[in-house]
């Protein structure tokens, strides 16, 4: 069965300087491959977070993603700025075989509105 990626919130509002959580769950970890968060779509989309061990300032995972059966890939963005506004997508990839990973499923997106403090 095809993996499903769920982002339950269509939008969230956060005051500048505060933190916000963007929720994402998947129905399966198979086929093996990373899960990444992006802001925007198409060629100009920006990688926001990858669950592959790298460090991303101001962003961290919410659940313990080292659990081998973890299906929760929500993230917390700290010290939000107006530049963080936009639509965020949680994307499941299938690992590539000596080529780039292949995107197989994306969540519906969560729009982040940043309110002036």
């Amino acid at each position: 069965t095809e993996v499903k990626v769920t982002q339950p919130e269509k939008s969230v509002s956060v005051a500048a300087g505060d933190s916000t959580i963007l929720n994402c769950t998947v129905t399966s970890l198979l086929p093996v491959g990373p899960i990444r968060w992006y802001r925007g779509v198409g060629q100009s989309r920006l990688l926001i977070y990858s669950f592959t061990g790298e460090h991303f300032p101001r962003i961290r995972n919410v659940s313990d993603t080292t659990k081998r059966n973890n299906m929760d890939f929500s993230i917390r963005i700290s010290n939000v700025t107006p530049e963080d506004a936009g639509t965020y997508y949680c994307v499941k990839f299938q690992r590539g075989s000596s080529e780039p990973d292949t995107e197989i499923q994306s969540g519906g997106g969560t729009e982040v509105y940043v309110l002036a403090k």
Partner: antibody
Amino acid sequence: DVQLVESGGGVVRPGESLRLSCAASGFTFSSNAMSWVRQAPGKGLEWLAGISAGGSDTYYPASVKGRFTISRDNSKNTLYLQMNTLTAEDTAVYYCARETWNHLFDYWGLGTLVTVSS
Amino acid sequence: SYELTQPPSVSVSPGQTARITCSGGDYYSTYYAWYQQKPGQAPVTVIHSDDKRPSDIPERFSGSSSGTTVTLTISGVQAEDEADYYCGGYDGRTYINTFGGGTKLTVL
């Protein structure tokens, strides 16, 4: 630099128990899953147990499940392996290893030798 | 569970290319790594996540995959590369780690 130092090995008699320790430094221990791997003399590598970063989830192959227990104390940056009802077949060098994001291993300790002999 | 199969031995002359294969995993659910072990020493990870090389590992080590077979390639083999090489796998379906039986690389 990442450093993993095992201790607690030694000579024990069949049927006895032993607890191994692995002291970790040079990285954020509480953020990484960990595993134990052993190698019998002249043999290959055998995975024994894995544990999530928070310590709530543990994983074992059928060969040692119920007899070996992995645990960790994140406040002490230490990983443990409790081994019960040891037999001669458990004689091996025991390594602790740090897991990558996808549960392979990137850093290994130097190992501690366990000898089970009457 | 699954078994990973490696050739027991591979021989190569210095400066040549050595290829060590590992088969038996399910590409849909398995990640692979390669571990080098010299006599009396602990294993060292030379490749993880199929083809990722740790920063302190020479560029002559590379990993690739094709179907259910993964390959460790050592280009321009040096005498210091003589060691046992273990293929390792993590199966996301069963949550189990497995090792191949190991391949002894001899540099002639």
